[in-house]
Interface confidence: medium
């Protein structure tokens, strides 16, 4: 299927790269504004300059454009534990990230929360913590993995998945209980 082109995309495709078609006169191609600027006035005629103005503080455009307004700078979400990696400039949005020894968990395409990397206590690091993935732990004998933490097999109930991993311990406990009742 051919993607449906909006009116703006159709108009732009008539002009050479780096130019856009004048909204009131489709025989005129105006030069797009550089990143860091926005369109204040269309070019008055062929070969004449487009009136572009620099983005105001708190806004940006990251690529050449013919936007009537700059985009608002993103704010890092403190409630998600995010910190500012680099501030917003006229040609680049704010870059948000996590602190050291934390990873990003994406709730959705635009939204991530920072969580502490697992330390693998009572286990070993199988895969190190990455920018977008928690540490992968392997647990020592007598421990099983629950929510990426190594938990003692003494906390393993028979109905849980841990029974396979903790089977020797469960049998030992059962054996001890049996010997205690004779």
């Amino acid at each position: 299927l051919v993607p449906h082109l909006g009116d703006r995309e159709k108009r732009d495709s008539v002009c050479p790269q780096g130019k856009y078609i004048h909204p009131q006169n489709n025989s005129i191609c105006c030069t797009k504004c550089h990143k860091g600027t926005y369109l204040y006035n269309d070019c008055p005629g062929p070969g004449q300059d487009t009136d572009c103005r620099e983005c105001e503080s708190g806004s940006f455009t990251a690529s050449e454009n013919h936007l009537r307004h700059c985009l608002s700078c993103s704010k890092c979400r403190k409630e998600m534990g995010q910190v500012e990696i680099s501030s917003c400039t006229v040609d680049r949005d704010t870059v948000c990230g996590c602190r050291k020894n934390q990873y990003r968990h994406y709730w959705s395409e635009n939204l991530f929360q920072c969580f502490n990397c697992s330390l693998c206590l009572n286990g070993t690091v199988h895969l190190s913590c990455q920018e977008k993935q928690n540490t992968v732990c392997t647990c020592h004998a007598g421990f099983f993995l629950r929510e990426n933490e190594c938990v003692s097999c003494s906390n393993c109930k028979k109905s849980l998945e841990c029974t396979k991993l903790c089977l020797p311990q469960i049998e030992n406990v059962k054996g001890t209980e049996d010997s205690g009742t004779t």
């Epitope: 985009l71 700078c73 993103s74 890092c76 979400r77 395409e109 635009n110």
Partner: nanobody, 116 residues
Framework: EVQLLESGGGLVQPGGSLRLSCAAS????????MYWVRQAPGKGLEWVSS????????YYADSVKGRFTISRDNSKNTLYLQMNSLRAEDTAVYYC?????????WGQGTLVTVSS
């Protein structure tokens, strides 16, 4: 002026259901990603669910997946959260929020109490 007004909270027994609504005004409703966020007593904010635009892609926190359903009615400018199989740990003030490159608009919240 952007306004978000939640309703539908209340007291419900464990295993019960509630449907939260969030009436939106003052902005072009379909153009924004919308969220439900909650705050349990004495705890921090917890993201619950979001619904995108276009396409209405939905996302859920693991703690509510399979029990909660987010939806939106663009003709009524309303966001919903259908909450089933409620648990005591779902007790919180629930807020709807508009995604405008940050959680820049919040409702006043609606209290959900799950208790027998």
């Amino acid at each position: 002026e952007v306004q978000l007004l939640e309703s539908g909270g209340g007291l419900v027994q464990p295993g019960g259901s509630l449907r939260l609504s969030c009436a939106a005004s003052g902005f072009t409703f379909p153009a924004d990603e919308m969220y439900w966020v909650r705050q349990a007593p004495g705890k921090g904010l917890e993201w619950v669910s979001s619904i995108g635009w276009p396409g209405g892609a939905t996302y859920y926190a693991d703690s509510v997946k399979g029990r909660f359903t987010i939806s939106r009615d663009n003709s009524k400018n309303t966001l919903y959260l259908q909450m089933n199989s409620l648990r005591a740990e779902d007790t919180a003030v629930y807020y709807c929020a508009k995604y405008g490159r940050n959680f820049d608009y919040w409702g006043q919240g609606t209290l959900v109490t799950v208790s027998s």
